[in-house]
Amino acid sequence: HHHHHHVPRWRQQWSGPGTTKRFPETVLARCVKYTEIHPEMRHVDCQSVWDAFKGAFISKHPCNITEEDYQPLMKLGTQTVPCNKILLWSRIKDLAHQFTQVQRDMFTLEDTLLGYLADDLTWCGEFNTSKINYQSCPDWRKDCSNNPVSVFWKTVSRRFAEAACDVVHVMLNGSRSKIFDKNSTFGSVEVHNLQPEKVQTLEAWVIHGGREDSRDLCQDPTIKELESIISKRNIQFSCKNIYRPDKFLQCVKNPEDSSCTSEI
């Protein structure tokens, strides 16, 4: 009797969670909200954006998605952000977003239309059917890397990094065993797509987790690995410890505060 609980045989069962519930409605609603808030994107037709998004993965095998599939969406979502105000992040998304919410002239990928649309969502389709798979989607490790979500983030991350210029900032999680992880989106995509002809310096902000953690995490071997990769690409590297992220945010909000002249 238990076989009734299984997904029908013809539907591929993947290792990762399925498409986020109400995915089409969520994408459309986010698009409308974003274009209302950002005047420079008011020209965007959200129905067309959804159609292009859908077209990238619907009726396609979810392990056979290419960057090419997302080109119509990329074209519709083309957006100019100040190239010298880009904040990348790795494994510390929440603080990065809190920062750009205060420092409004700086932008993470998720502050752009395409990043905003897809943030925290999962999606995939099925080969030869127009259905969205709400049961399961391919896991990057266990199933395949060329899945709809991974290819999307690889595509938008590459474009975002390619657009950067002057000094690019990256927020890194000092509490992780690998502060810089070569396998992260930052380490595998963004680092290699910064353009030395445009980017002069990558400045890493290493965010400390512990209250009493006064170690210089810029000496971490993985930071030195990042430094080496960046320097070999003819980009200067700068590293700063953010010992007190709470105070750091507070000082971004109130730079005149007398306690904000000391190291944060």
Partner: antibody, heavy 119, light 107 residues
Framework: QVQLQESGPGLVKPSETLSLTCTVS????????IHWLRQPPGKGLEWIGV???????DYNPSLKSRVTISKDTSKSQVSLKLSSVTAADTAVYYC?????????????WGQGTLVTVSS | EIVMTQSPPTLSLSPGERVTLSCRAS??????LVWYQQKPGQAPRLLIS???SLETSIPARFSGSGSGTDYTLTISSLQPEDFAVYYC?????????FGQGTKVEIK
């Protein structure tokens, strides 16, 4: 505050090795690269080379065969050795700190030390 | 190596005048250019990096511009303390190279 100071003999004989030391304070050699530059009297500046914070070095190809830069982090000292000197190596020698962790230009300089090559 | 050429070699000017110093690279240096000021018996002092970014404590009368191979340092109104030699440096590729300098002297 950040300070750099060059020291070493002011007179070196031709064919000998010029040896200078740069002593730094106000920052750690594990955090910044140190560059050596020189300026012949009345002339322009020439970059000699750099020792990065991790200990690797880059040298000016025109001097590479004669130059060695090393450091003793615990003493906050960087040394420059230039072998087989000639009168053309007479110059004011400067050490300078890279502006950022791996910086390709210089925000703090030593006051410079004049080295004359003469017999 | 990239050759940096500064012009003119010497400028004779009076306080209050506007000064434009030129620096040309033998190939595109992609805005990797700094300017230094050097006074007799002193080490160079960093003024501007990345073509336009003024170092802290450098007066706003100094400004930089340019792209590709051609770059300019402008002093909007010469002050007595500005008479010195000015060097440009490229940091696009090693060996990092300097111009031969422009001497700004009192007329």
């Amino acid at each position: 505050q950040v300070q750099l100071q060059e020291s070493g003999p002011g007179l070196v004989k031709p064919s000998e090795t010029l040896s200078l030391t740069c002593t730094v304070s106000g920052f750690s050699l594990t955090s910044y690269g140190i560059h050596w530059l020189r300026q012949p009297p009345g002339k322009g500046l020439e970059w000699i080379g750099v020792i990065w914070r991790g200990g690797s070095t880059d040298y000016n190809p025109s001097l590479k065969s004669r130059v060695t830069i090393s450091k003793d982090t615990s003493k906050s000292q960087v040394s420059l050795k230039l072998s087989s000197v000639t009168a053309a190596d007479t110059a004011v020698y400067y050490c300078a700190k890279g502006k950022v962790t791996t910086g390709f230009y210089f925000d703090f300089w030593g006051q410079g030390t004049l080295v004359t090559v003469s017999s | 190596e990239i050759v940096m050429t500064q012009s003119p070699p010497t400028l004779s000017l009076s306080p209050g005048e506007r000064v434009t110093l030129s620096c040309r690279a033998s190939e595109d240096i992609y805005n990797r250019l700094v300017w230094y000021q050097q006074k007799p018996g002193q080490a160079p002092r960093l003024l501007i990096s990345g073509v336009t970014s003024l170092e802290t404590s450098i007066p706003a009368r100094f400004s930089g511009s340019g792209s590709g191979t051609d770059y300019t340092l402008t002093i909007s109104s010469l002050q007595p303390e500005d008479f010195a030699v000015y060097y440009c440096q490229q940091y696009w590729s090693t060996p990092y190279t300097f111009g031969q300098g422009t001497k700004v002297e009192i007329k």
